[in-house]
Interface confidence: medium
């Protein structure tokens, strides 16, 4: 199990990352080597190192190892991006659960099961003992952390700081208890790295001892990180290749989460009458194969034995003997009742896309030529030839008329968010069509995300309103009221338009909402002279998945000393890392002594990759998101309200670069906030402002 060459499996890899020590007292050791495996072996055995090795960096360019007595969670250390570096951290030091008896546990829990603080191992007060760090080398008897140096039954323990209680076990959960999965674990991205019989998993990026096809670079969406259990191929549950040369692979013991329903985002589009895509979401009642032979029940083993049972494939709806596609086959199928024909496809089920032609688009859909002619809200598209005047108004080139046939969804203006069409409804002049990007299409809609090619600021200088520089006031800040109470923030980007978040509108009735502008106090106290109260006349929802809303005001705001607009960034721009920004909000804190005044938190921009690392790799950021971290350690980056802005300055110009939305890990110490990236949606915002009618003041 633990041959020398296999110790790299005990490390968590963070690609293109290194550690920089801020504290000069921290030691490091370097040496030229050929492979990361060599670094790992030395780190694991601590051979020739003047410290306990907790992590190392392999410098691929210089073929060099840097060993550390610290890891990314240690104080006095920061992570840094670097193409040539790969960071490897010993899992034992970053794991917060135990395997088996917890002999290898090296985490930082220092409280016993009943809540008593642990006594430091190097101390003899209040309890004398023989468990000295010097006597138990390699057992990491550091500080007062819970440990199990002898591998005893109860798991990690410690001597306690209570003179009445000599020692007690610590309440550290088993990793198999902490980890859970939904359905058959296809979306599981947890950290289980050993099989149900206790064998250590082989790294996915290694081909020894077992050669395999599941290369991380070939399947970037399958979560092939380190040597964690995964289910890339529709098995009943997650599995991995093992380090045992005699056992190619084994299942992992991961329990099913208490709520075994899939997230709405994981579920394929469910259909009952026809097949969408490969029919993984088909939930109809067809129960014969193409030639009429009846299907065998999924819960039966006669006439064909199989493991495609409802128990093994919990979320695949294997009811009765209905045709299904539980394993990613090309279309729904079943085992047949004919003993001579094991399986058959149910190819007689019609395809849902028959009526729509193409059901997906590539890139931004500018070459989409399907015949869908309905918007996402169900409005029928109007003929292109009736709308050419409007189209010319917002594009500066001659559209390809040959593509604009009938009233089919098209993308003549290179919209980043896919095909759209005009409607016959004057309130909603145009909208996107309910077509998705083709599965597996990775064409970026914005190029060069990580290179500051386009500046975010327009080239004009700072604008001044009535002699007061706009950057000294926050007149663009909007308090969205729901039934007379503040619920969200927003940004005034044009006299009649407020940019905010989709989740801020629990009710459909616009009479329930008001926008308050020009206030500093959330209750409007002392702001009577400057406050403007405006009704809401329309909500325009952003492109699918954006979480943005443009809220149209019933009448334009009057711009004055207290109310101003804030600029939008250029489309697709990149703001440099470490740019100083701020989030604003009245903070829906619920505290009794809350003074109700507008708050500001200062953040700095962080690159998406580094941001993902700060979130321990649990979130992958895409081109529609922007990340900003707090300057003060432990200061939550989202102290403002949902819907409120992330405001940054470039070339002396303030812009709204992000929007605060729920569910992106805000206000967690040391975790940067993730915001909707306004630059990605800037063209959509401009297009709405240009094409939607607004009342005149």
């Amino acid at each position: 199990q633990r041959k020398r060459r296999n110790t790299i499996h005990e490390f968590k890899k963070s690609a293109k990352t290194t550690l920089i020590k801020i504290d000069p007292a921290l030691k490091i050791k370097t040496k030229k080597v050929n492979t990361a495996d060599q670094c790992a072996n030395r780190c694991t055995r601590n051979k020739g190192l003047p410290f306990t090795c907790k992590a190392f960096v392999f410098d691929k360019a210089r073929k060099q190892c840097l060993w550390f007595p610290f890891n990314s969670m240690s104080s006095g250390v920061k992570k840094e991006f670097g193409h040539e570096f790969d960071l490897y951290e010993n899992k034992d030091y970053i794991r917060n659960c135990i395997i088996g008896k917890g002999r290898s546990y090296k985490g930082t829990v220092s409280i016993t099961k009943s809540g008593i603080k642990c006594q430091p191992w190097s101390s003899m007060i209040p309890h004398e003992h023989s468990f000295l760090p010097s006597s138990y080398r390699g057992k990491d008897l550091q500080e007062n952390y819970c440990r199990n140096p002898r591998g005893e039954e109860g798991g990690p323990w410690c001597f306690t700081s209570n003179p009445e209680v000599r020692y007690e076990v610590c309440d550290i959960p088993q990793c198999s208890e902490v980890e859970c999965m939904t359905c058959n674990g296809e979306s599981y991205r947890g950290l289980m790295d050993h099989t149900e019989s206790g064998k250590i998993c082989q790294r996915w990026d290694h081909q020894t001892p077992h050669r395999h096809k599941f290369l991380p670079e070939r399947y970037p969406d399958k979560g092939f990180d380190d040597n964690y259990c995964r289910n890339p191929d529709g098995q009943p549950r997650p599995w991995c290749y093992t380090l045992d040369p005699h056992t190619r692979w084994e299942y992992c013991a991961i329990k099913t989460c208490a709520d075994n329903t899939m997230n709405d985002t994981d579920v394929p589009l469910e259909t009952t009458e026809c097949i969408q895509g490969q029919g993984e979401g088909y939930r109809g009642t067809v129960n014969t194969i193409w030639n009429g032979i009846p299907c065998q029940r999924w819960d039966s083993q006669y006439p064909h034995e199989h493991d495609m049972t409802p128990e093994n494939f919990k979320c695949k709806d294997l009811r009765e003997n209905y045709c299904r596609n539980p394993d990613g086959s090309e279309s729904p199928w079943c085992f047949t009742t004919d003993p001579n024909i094991r399986v058959g496809y149910c190819s007689q089920i019609p395809n849902c896309d028959m009526s729509h032609g193409q059901d997906c688009y590539r890139g931004n859909g500018k070459n989409y030529m399907g015949n869908l002619s309905q918007t996402r809200s169900g409005l029928t598209c109007s003929m292109w030839d009736k709308n050419m005047e409007d189209l010319h108004r917002h594009i500066f080139w001659e559209p390809d008329a040959s593509k604009l046939n009938e009233n089919y969804c098209r993308n003549p203006d290179d919209d980043a968010h896919g095909p759209w069409c005009y409607t016959g409804n004057p309130l909603i002049p145009w909208d996107y069509c309910p077509i998705s990007r083709c599965e597996g299409d990775t064409t970026p809609t914005i190029v060069n995300l990580d290179h500051p090619v386009i500046s975010c600021a327009k080239t004009k200088q700072l604008r001044v309103v009535n002699g007061i520089p706009t950057r000294t006031n926050i007149g663009w800040m909007v308090s969205l009221r729901y039934r007379n109470k503040h619920i969200c923030g927003g940004s005034l980007i044009k006299e009649s338009w407020v940019l905010t978040a989709r989740q801020c509108f629990p009710s459909r009735d616009l009479k329930d909402y008001e926008a308050w502008l020009g206030i500093h106090d959330v209750h409007g106290r002392g702001d009577e002279k400057c406050k403007q109260v405006l009704n809401v006349s329309q909500l325009v929802y952003g492109p699918e998945g954006s979480d943005l809303v443009l809220m149209k005001l019933a009448r334009p705001a009057v711009l004055d000393d207290f109310v101003s607009t804030i600029d939008l960034p250029n489309y697709g721009c990149t703001i440099p890392e470490k740019t100083s920004c701020s989030v604003y909000g009245w903070g829906y804190t619920g505290l009794i002594n809350y003074d109700g005044l507008l708050r500001v938190a200062h953040l700095y921009i962080m690159g998406n990759e580094k941001c993902s690392q700060h979130h321990r790799g649990k979130v992958t950021l895409n081109e529609s998101e922007i990340c900003a971290g707090a300057e003060k350690i432990g200061s939550g980056p989202c102290e403002g309200d949902y819907g409120g802005p992330l405001v940054c300055e470039q070339h002396k110009m303030r812009m709204v670069l992000g929007v605060i939305v729920p569910g992106r890990g805000c206000a967690i110490p040391n975790r940067p906030g993730i915001f909707v990236r306004v630059a990605y949606y800037a063209k959509w915002i401009h297009k709405i402002i240009l094409t939607y009618k607004v009342p005149q003041s």
């Epitope: 939904t182 989460c257 208490a258 709520d259 075994n260 329903t261 899939m262 997230n263 709405d264 039934r483 619920i487 969200c488 989709r502 989740q503 801020c504 509108f505 629990p506 009710s507 459909r508 009735d509 009479k511 329930d512 829906y588 619920g590 949902y642 729920p662 569910g663 992106r664």
Partner: antibody, heavy 114, light 114 residues
Framework: VEESGGRLVMPGTPLTLTCTVS????????ISWVRQAPEKGLEWIGV?????VTDYASWAQGRFTISKTSTTVDLKIPSPTTEDTATYFC?????????????WGPGTLVTVSS | DIVMTQTPSSVEAAVGGTVTIKCQAS??????LAWYQQKPGQRPKLLIY???TLASGVPSRFKGSGSGTQFTLTISDLECADAATYYC????????????????FGGGTEVVVK
């Protein structure tokens, strides 16, 4: 979703029911509380949205308080009466605002009696 | 208030037969209506939302129709397992009325299968 905290209480004794969620996030879904008196129909009490704001049925206003943490939603009954004897369900609201309930807990029984 | 009136309160039918349950709203609720099934001692289960869309895993024997103020749930090829109480739920509201005019359930219809 799973409710807990239901028990036999005397009238006027404050009670808190807890709805624990897993497998989905309260930052994506609103949660509603619904109750059902013995042998009676379903009665909607209130909702807590993604953004932490609450709404109540007018008969429930002042009689109940809904609050949440990252994985739990509480229903506080500050001064229960015998009419509050019922099974209390929490339900996941599809999406973040007004919508149907696509996932229900098994319910927790509250008996108010002297 | 928007009142949801469900009829009949109880209906009996034979295995293999068809049952029709009606739900009437006192004002236009468009298609913002859901149907739930509740068996004795169990949690409610979503059957249909948006008036006619079948929820995941629900057999196509259940059919919802209607819009505006008149809605119908039809259960065909009745099975013993369909014996339950069925509720309609309106999730539209208008702030012209008081705030408890949404997420209102009908009184329920008990379906007895012979």
């Amino acid at each position: 979703v799973e409710e807990s905290g239901g028990r036999l209480v005397m009238p006027g004794t404050p009670l808190t029911l807890t709805c624990t969620v897993s497998g989905f996030s309260l930052s994506s879904n609103a949660i509603s509380w619904v109750r059902q008196a013995p042998e009676k129909g379903l009665e909607w009490i209130g909702v807590i949205y993604v953004i932490g704001v609450t709404d109540y049925a007018s008969w429930a206003q002042g009689r109940f308080t809904i609050s949440k943490t990252s994985t739990t939603v509480d229903l506080k009954i500050p001064s229960p009466t015998t009419e509050d004897t019922a099974t209390y369900f929490c339900a996941r609201v599809y999406d973040s605002g007004w919508n149907h309930f696509n996932l229900w807990g098994p319910g927790t029984l509250v008996t108010v009696s002297s | 208030d928007i009142v949801m009136t469900q009829t009949p309160s109880s209906v009996e039918a034979a295995v293999g037969g068809t049952v029709t349950i009606k739900c009437q709203a006192s004002e236009n609720i468009y298609r913002l209506l859901a149907w739930y099934q509740q068996k004795p001692g169990q949690r409610p289960k979503l059957l249909i939302y948006s008036a006619s869309t079948l929820a995941s895993g629900v057999p196509s024997r259940f059919k919802g129709s209607g819009s505006g103020t008149q809605f119908t749930l039809t259960i065909s090829d009745l099975e013993c397992a369909d014996a339950a109480t069925y509720y309609c739920q309106n999730y539209y509201y208008s702030s012209r009325s008081s705030y408890d005019t949404y997420n209102v359930f009908g009184g329920g219809t008990e379906v007895v299968v012979k």
